[in-house]
Interface confidence: medium
Amino acid sequence: GITIPRNPGCPNSEDKNFPRTVMVNLNIHNRNTNTNPKRSSDYYNRSTSPWNLHRNEDPERYPSVIWEAKCRHLGCINADGNVDYHMNSVPIQQEILVLRREPPHCPNSFRLEKILVSVGCTCVTPIVHHVA
Amino acid sequence: GITIPRNPGCPNSEDKNFPRTVMVNLNIHNRNTNTNPKRSSDYYNRSTSPWNLHRNEDPERYPSVIWEAKCRHLGCINADGNVDYHMNSVPIQQEILVLRREPPHCPNSFRLEKILVSVGCTCVTPIVHHVA
C-alpha cells in the first residue's frame, strides 16, 4: 500500500487492521466563512423545478437534522407559471458523510456512514423512447 | 467535566477537554443500497441550467476527490436550445462534512471540517430590482 510520510508529531497507532480506526478532533473547522448565509435558501421557490424541504431527523447521527428536497411537480414551471409536462423536474442527489455512534450510546466511538441526499431539483429534457 | 452515561463496551476516554478527540471507524457503512447508480449522472447535460463538473482533489482530505458543479451559462436553455438571459442558472450548494489530516500527513489523525460544495444547477426567475 501507499506509505504516507509521517509527521513526527503524529499520534501513534499500532492498529494496522482494516477497518481503520482513527482519532478525530471534534472542534469542527468551518471553511464557509465568506459565503452568503442566504445561499440557496430561496431557490427552492424561484426555480422552474421548485422543491419542498423535508426534515430527516436522527438524534443518533451527526448532523442530526438533514433537509431533503422533494420536487413539487413531475414537470417544470413555464413562463406562464403553469406546469409543462414536456419537461421533467428531477432531484439532484449527493452522497454525503455522516457520523453515527457505534457501539450505540458510546460518547467517544463513531463510524463514518455514507447517505444519499436530494439537495434540490433541476429541470431536464426527458429521455423519449421511440417504439419502432 | 460532563459525565455522559456510558455503554460498558465503550472505548475509554479520560480526556475531558474541549476540543474533544474521538475514535472514528473508517470502514464506511453505505446506506445507499437500493439507489440507482446512474443517479444524477446525466442531468448535468440535460438540464435547462446545465453544469460542468470540476474535480477538486486534496490528498490531505477525506474524501480526497470532490466534484464541484459550475453552471455553464448565466441564463437558462430555452425550448429552442438557446440561452435565455431572462432566467438565471444558479448553483445549488450544500454544506458537507469531510475529514482533514491534522497534523498534516498523519495517517491516523484527523479534524472534522465543514465545506460548502456546489452539487448542480437549477434555473430560477431572477430577482428584479426596480429603481423608483
Partner: nanobody, 119 residues
Framework: QVQLVESGGGLVQPGGSLRLSCTAS????????MYWVRQAPGKGLEWVAN????????YYVDSVKGRFTISRDNARNSLYLQMISLRAEDTAVYYC????????????WGQGTLVTVSS
C-alpha cells in the same frame, strides 16, 4: 430552520435570582439533550448544565452545583435555567444549545441572553 430563542437575562445584584428560558423550533425537541453554555466577557465558552431528552438526568459544572437548576417542558418545546445565589463570576451571555451526538459540540445556538451580576 433550527431556531433557539433565549430570554430572561438582565441585571441582578449578588445573591439575587433569575430564570432563563429558551424556546426551540425546527426540530423534535423531545429527541435531544439540551444544554446551557455561557461566555463571560473576554473568556471562552463554558458548559454550564445539560439535561437528557426526557428530563430524567441533569449534569452541572461544579461552580454552579446547588445554585442552578436546569429543566425542560417538552410539550412547550422549552428549556429553562433557574439561577439563585448569583455571583459576580456568573456574569456572562447565556446560550441554549441543541445536543448532538458529538460530545460538547453544538451546531445550533440561540442569540444568547446577557446576565449581569453587579451591585
Amino acid at each position: 430552520q433550527v431556531q433557539l430563542v433565549e430570554s430572561g437575562g438582565g441585571l441582578v445584584q449578588p445573591g439575587g435570582s433569575l430564570r432563563l428560558s429558551c424556546t426551540a423550533s425546527g426540530f423534535t425537541f423531545s429527541n435531544y439533550s439540551m444544554y446551557w453554555v455561557r461566555q463571560a466577557p473576554g473568556k471562552g465558552l463554558e458548559w454550564v448544565a445539560n439535561i437528557k431528552q426526557d428530563g430524567s438526568e441533569e449534569y452541572y459544572v461544579d461552580s454552579v452545583k446547588g445554585r442552578f437548576t436546569i429543566s425542560r417542558d417538552n410539550a412547550r418545546n422549552s428549556l429553562y435555567l433557574q439561577m439563585i445565589s448569583l455571583r459576580a463570576e456568573d456574569t456572562a451571555v447565556y446560550y441554549c444549545a441543541k445536543g448532538e451526538i458529538l460530545p460538547l459540540y453544538f451546531d445550533h445556538w440561540g442569540q444568547g441572553t446577557l446576565v449581569t451580576v453587579s451591585s
